[in-house]
Interface confidence: medium
């Protein structure tokens, strides 16, 4: 901060801080003060400090969702869009395309298949999968979508699953599944979506997506 | 603020602000101060300011969800309830009825059809649609619910969609669709829900709803 | 707070608070001040207070999701897992097992059937139910899952419902329902999930869950 250079005369410090000591005494409940009422003093000073803080919040750029409550607590959120894949894996592929969200580098899409977070905390994680299947052309087993977690040094685990029996509609019947829940993630944890048959997934606009938000 | 009218005598300003200049010097790291240790000064003053701020947060009425972190960052959330409509449009109609939520005027329900936000930011937006349809009585195409975005000066965009093939149950078979995702909205942006056949939508308590919350 | 005991000399209070009165006047727009420019005074003081507040935010422990924005605003979230029950009630049973979440004692699972909150506010509440049913073996009525609210001194009410017609698959066809919405809860309010036939609910890992998060 720039110094108040226009002030040249400095009084003895033991006088200067009587101001603070007095407020301090007000705050700790001492009532030996004359002339000024403690509540008056405190309310005036509190009012001013609150004005400052209000002003501090007003000057935050409202058009940025990256930073919230200071650099210490940025918003962390992602929403990615399904991508058709020639891979035979049951793990769905995603892309940062269309109307996607990637708030900052505290959440990343890795290898097009998993959302990885850098900060520990509670996250609401969700996935939506639309698929088209036919009972006769599919296996007996239902179509299952699973939201899975891989934390560093730990085995994968299923967080959420949904199951829908195949439709009798021809050539196939479309159905949509939505999964969502609150989970604690460790730094470096990744979440991904598994389905029983990726070839049945619908990739038209908005049909299949995956995301999270940090509480 | 009310002025401290009980104080009538004013000293020369060059004296009054030595207080602040001294704290300032403490803050900028100057160590030419006698009598009082900077850390002591700063810690006392910080403690008091923090008490004020803590007190500021404590005195917020906890039964009000309107304001959060000062007027600059109020909670923004809405949950509206479906309304049957004689309109032929595919856009669903909503109402602030039943157990609805409308946190403040930073989100509004416009023309009974769209939720409009005043602040830019990340929002979790969701919709739930329950419908009753029959394969024979409906078109070949599935029932599709779309969550759409209209930003000022832009075309509408589909954010999310879900599709369910019609049931073979008679007279009709009920099914529920849930959509939800995180999206950045611009000031003045509106979100609304489109369905292929609004006449098939179920409007019983809790079956069809629409909402959002700002992260 | 410890008093500034090193300060022994106390000046007349009418002098001590000229400092605050002057800043106050600056703040209220009075421009009768000489020597020092109000903007300079205010900006110096604001800067220091903001530094304090920044420092306050920096010292928050990042690895704890329990406390957010001070003790006044802890994170409140829960995610519980379905539990098979021999009870004949239509209310689903839940447990803190598997990868569950229970942020703190401001939300609790009571009697294994309801999530109860201690603080008033806006909550995003969700439930997912997977069930397996057959049209011939079930009643005509669809399978319905309801998210219900019980507030102290008030009747229960339905917040959200979803309905799915039974499958024609044999022995039964699986389907998943997801419910979610933003609602204001009062202190002591409880939310629970009702289904038409609990015996049809699937309790495999991740299939059926229930949770909430406070905005």
């Amino acid at each position: 901060h720039r110094r108040l250079d226009k002030i040249e005369d400095e009084r003895n410090l033991h006088e200067d801080f009587v101001f603070m000591k007095t407020i301090q005494r007000c705050n700790t409940g001492e009532r030996s003060l004359s002339l000024l009422n403690c509540e008056e003093i405190k309310s005036q000073f509190e009012g001013f400090v609150k004005d400052i803080m209000l002003n501090k919040e007003e000057t935050k750029k409202e058009n940025s969702f990256e930073m919230q409550k200071g650099d210490q607590n940025p918003q962390i959120a992602a929403h990615v869009i399904s991508e058709a894949s020639s891979k035979t894996t049951s793990v769905l592929q995603w892309a940062e395309k269309g109307y996607y969200t990637m708030s900052n580098n505290l959440v990343t899409l890795e290898n097009g298949k998993q959302l990885t977070v850098k900060r520990q905390g509670l996250y609401y994680i969700y996935a939506q999968v639309t698929f088209c299947s036919n009972r006769e052309a599919s296996s007996q087993a239902p179509f299952i979508a699973s939201l899975c977690l891989k934390s560093p040094g730990r085995f994968e685990r299923i967080l959420l699953r949904a199951a829908n029996t195949h439709s009798s509609a021809k050539p196939c019947g479309q159905q949509s599944i939505h999964l969502g829940g609150v989970f604690e993630l460790q730094p470096g944890a990744s979440v991904f979506v598994n389905v029983t048959d990726p070839s049945q997934v619908s990739h038209g606009t908005g049909f299949t997506s995956f995301g999270l938000l940090k509480l | 603020h009310r002025r401290l009218d009980k104080i009538e005598d004013e000293r020369n300003l060059h004296e009054d602000f030595v207080f602040m200049k001294t704290i300032q010097r403490c803050n900028t790291g100057e160590r030419s101060l006698s009598l009082l240790n900077c850390e002591e000064i700063k810690s006392q003053f910080e403690g008091f300011v923090k008490d004020i701020m803590l007190n500021k947060e404590e005195t917020k009425k906890e039964n009000s969800f309107e304001m959060q972190k000062g007027d600059q960052n109020p909670q923004i959330a809405a949950h509206v309830i479906s309304e049957a409509s004689s309109k032929t449009t595919s856009v669903l109609q909503w109402a602030e009825k039943g157990y609805y939520t409308m946190s403040n005027n930073l989100v509004t329900l416009e023309n009974g059809k769209q939720l409009t936000v005043k602040r830019q930011g990340l929002y979790y937006i969701y919709a739930q649609v329950t419908f009753c349809s029959n394969r024979e009585a409906s078109s070949q195409a599935p029932f599709i619910a779309s969550l759409c975005l209209k930003s000022p000066g832009r075309f509408e965009r589909i954010l999310l969609r879900a599709a369910n093939t019609h049931s073979s149950a008679k007279p009709c078979g009920q099914q529920s669709i849930h959509l939800g995702g995180v999206f950045e909205l611009q000031p003045g942006a509106s979100v609304f829900v489109n369905v292929t056949d609004p006449s098939q939508v179920s409007h019983g308590t809790g079956f069809t709803s629409f909402g959002l919350l700002k992260l | 707070h410890r008093r500034l005991d090193k300060i022994e000399d106390e000046r007349n209070l009418h002098e001590d608070f000229v400092f605050m009165k002057t800043i106050q006047r600056c703040n209220t727009g009075e421009r009768s001040l000489s020597l020092l420019n109000c903007e300079e005074i205010k900006s110096q003081f604001e800067g220091f207070v903001k530094d304090i507040m920044l420092n306050k935010e920096e010292t928050k422990k990042e690895n704890s999701f329990e406390m957010q924005k001070g003790d006044q605003n802890p994170q409140i979230a829960a995610h519980v897992i379905s539990e098979a029950s021999s009870k004949t009630t239509s209310v689903l049973q839940w447990a803190e097992k598997g990868y569950y979440t229970m942020s703190n004692n401001l939300v609790t699972l009571e009697n294994g059937k309801q999530l109860t909150v201690k603080r008033q506010g806006l909550y995003y509440i969700y439930a997912q139910v997977t069930f397996c049913s057959n049209r011939e073996a079930s009643s005509q009525a669809p399978f319905i899952a309801s998210l219900c609210l019980k507030s102290p001194g008030r009747f229960e009410r339905i917040l959200l419902r979803a309905a799915n017609t039974h499958s024609s698959a044999k022995p039964c066809g699986q389907q998943s329902i997801h419910l979610g919405g933003v609602f204001e809860l009062q202190p002591g309010a409880s939310v629970f999930v009702n289904v038409t036939d609990p015996s049809q609910v699937s309790h495999g890992t991740g299939f059926t869950s229930f949770g909430l998060l406070k905005l």
């Epitope: 038209g204 606009t205 | 195409a141 759409c148 209209k150 509408e156 589909i158 489109n194 | -």
Partner: antibody, heavy 118, light 107 residues
Framework: EVKLVESGGGLVKPGGSLKLSCTTS????????MSWVRQTPEKRLEWVAS???????YYFDSVRGRFTISRDNARNILYLQMSSLRSEDTAMYYC?????????????WGQGTSVTVS | DIQMTQSPASLSASVGETVTITCRAS??????LAWYQQKQGRSPQLLVY???TLAEGVPSRFSGSGSGTQFSLKINSLQPEDFGSYYC?????????FGTGTKLELK
Amino acid sequence: EVKLVESGGGLVKPGGSLKLSCTTSGFTFNNYAMSWVRQTPEKRLEWVASISSGDSTYYFDSVRGRFTISRDNARNILYLQMSSLRSEDTAMYYCARHYDYDSYAMDYWGQGTSVTVS
Amino acid sequence: DIQMTQSPASLSASVGETVTITCRASETIYSYLAWYQQKQGRSPQLLVYNAKTLAEGVPSRFSGSGSGTQFSLKINSLQPEDFGSYYCQHHYNTPLTFGTGTKLELK
């Protein structure tokens, strides 16, 4: 097969009116945004107006207040009501469907109907 | 309004050659750019949207690239049916605007 067929064009005097129609088939009309685009005699393409699946309307500045775009979802027809016509409105008018992906590019166009203001 | 500047205005090439047409937007349009082909006496046909995604049925010799303000359409190994006019169009906001067109002629 997706089909768009324009009609209603012709010769009209300045200040006159004309109503163009675009009859569609082969797709679920009410799920799509639709537009009118014109091509001037100099072969320049100009967007004229659009209507979303939710019935929101958008207009090119030079036609706003004079032209009205509308749709009849029951009959799968798109309309363009043109009034206060000017010589600079002379063009081939195409109706087009907006592509159903994250894009509002136009994937199907009609064969066009000619409008001459003279 | 966003202006779309297309170049060149005309281009002569032979069958089998590779050609590139460029389009510049007056401000960023991210990836919201489409390319159309129009043959004499016909209506425009969508080739590419979102700057690089080929529309259904479009041969793989066509490719789009670019983002922000600079875009290009490349046609590898020109075929006789590729001759005609090409237009770029942004689909970022209203008003939608088109480039002035590039006439691709047989040399």
